[in-house]
Interface confidence: medium
């Protein structure tokens, strides 16, 4: 029950996270004009990954897309790539995790396959979340660097001769959405991985019982309950039912069901 809840919650959290990553990627407010000491009559500039916008003091807003690909800064391209990779991985992860959900029965899918899919989706969510966090952080770093550069220029001018007022940009709402969404996707992924660790021993115990019933002898080795949970000499036998989807190292990394009691 705890495993199902963990898996379900992991799925929901990841779903919210990926929706947030998509929203952040599409949002226009990645960088917003620093309004420090700005006049009431000023226009408000803000920029996204795909277009930049100007909101007049009247409230009228006009946005223009970046209709060039080669002319854009490499960092912006990198952020776009990271966010898209995050979305794609997250979407695939969601698709995989739907089939992996314990509460959903699809034909005669083995629990071992579900555990496998849960782990796969969990890893995808983790990578997706990391991509989003990385993308947002790269953009934020770019903003911080430019902010202080323009602040320096603002006070020094060109050799103190010309007074220039540059538009400074600060963190937009999309950055916070991206950070939170990336974090949620990451958490969801971790939860899926934890759920997977819970799925594996349960199905192993079940397989061990049916295996014994078929008349084969069980080789007990020293080491307490390990032999009966697939952590000892049974791991080789277990591979027959596993479809070879996991390495022995992966199997051995799972705790027994007793760890959840």
């Amino acid at each position: 029950m705890a495993v199902t809840a963990c898996q379900g919650l992991g799925f929901v959290v990841s779903l919210i996270g990926i929706a947030g990553i998509i929203a952040a990627t599409c949002m226009d407010q990645w960088s917003t004009q620093d309004l420090y000491n700005n006049p009431v009559t000023a226009v408000f500039n803000y920029q996204g990954l795909w277009r930049s916008c100007v909101r007049e003091s009247s409230g009228f807003t006009e946005c223009r897309g970046y209709f060039t690909l080669l002319g854009l800064p490499a960092m912006l391209q990198a952020v776009r790539a990271l966010m898209i990779v995050g979305i794609v991985l997250g979407a695939i992860g969601l698709l995989v995790s739907i089939f992996a959900l314990k509460c959903i029965r699809i034909g005669s899918m083995e629990d071992s396959a579900k555990a496998n899919m849960t782990l796969t989706s969990g890893i995808m969510f983790i990578v997706s979340g990391l991509c989003a966090i990385a993308g947002v952080s790269v953009f934020a770093n770019m903003l911080v660097t430019n902010f202080w550069m323009s602040t320096a220029n603002m006070y020094t001018g060109m050799g103190g001769m010309v007074q220039t007022v540059q538009t400074r940009y600060t963190f937009g709402a999309a950055l916070f959405v991206g950070w939170v969404a990336g974090g949620l996707t990451l958490i969801g992924g971790v939860m899926m991985c934890i759920a997977c660790r819970g799925l594996a021993p349960e199905e192993t115990n079940y397989k061990a019982v049916s295996y014994h019933a078929s008349g084969h002898s069980v080789a007990y080795k020293p080491g307490g309950f390990k032999a009966s949970t697939g952590f000892g000499s049974n791991t080789k036998n277990k591979k027959i039912y596993d479809g070879g989807a996991r390495t022995e190292d992966e199997v051995q990394s799972y705790p027994s069901k007793h760890d959840y009691v």
Epitope: N37, P39, V40, T41, A42, V43, E56, S57, S58, G59, F60, E62, V162, Q163, V165
Partner: antibody, heavy 117, light 107 residues
Framework: EVQLQQSGPELVKPGASVKMSCKAS????????MHWVKQKPGQGLEWIGY????????KTSEKFKGKATLTSDKSSSTAYMEINSLTSEDSAVYYC??????????WGQGTLVTVSA | DIQMNQSPSSLSASLGDTITITCHAS??????LSWYQQKPGNFPKLLIY???NLHTGVPSRFSGSGSGTGFTLTISSLQPEDIATYYC?????????FGAGTKLELK
Amino acid sequence: EVQLQQSGPELVKPGASVKMSCKASGYTFTRYIMHWVKQKPGQGLEWIGYFNPYNDDSKTSEKFKGKATLTSDKSSSTAYMEINSLTSEDSAVYYCAKLRQERIAYWGQGTLVTVSA
Amino acid sequence: DIQMNQSPSSLSASLGDTITITCHASQNIDVWLSWYQQKPGNFPKLLIYKASNLHTGVPSRFSGSGSGTGFTLTISSLQPEDIATYYCQQGQSYPLTFGAGTKLELK
């Protein structure tokens, strides 16, 4: 090219009211706030207020509250200012002006209002 | 309201002179100050915005400087067509306020 075409001069009696117009062309009318400025003969410039055609919001300076009413007609891209209870103090040239950020880059040619019995 | 104190109120100069008009704001307006030129019977024309930026089509002999509360308009090498009244205007907050004006005359 941005143009602000104001209505012609007005000769009005004290106590009456006057409504002047300012037709905008060469830009999206609802995009920018329209301001109104008063200039008495031989004197300086005085900000009356603004009308925002985008959301029909208006703001007038304390001095002109209850005196000036600002409106607009989006369909004809025209801004209006009505001044009521006219006195000799209201005899002036009234300009409509288009603000770009903090600066008035475009002005109407002005409407001369003369209050005389 | 932000008061704009402009000085001098009138100024006599000869052609080719460099003249300076000052404008003082009653509170900090950063760089949100514009300068206008008005000739008799005409509407004001924008010369300088954001304290030091020259508006399109304005001759380079006009220049502006200052920030915070003190601002100056400088006309180098005065020309006959520069004879007019000059106004400063703050755009930091409503109500927008203008200086009383500086009437420039030829000596």
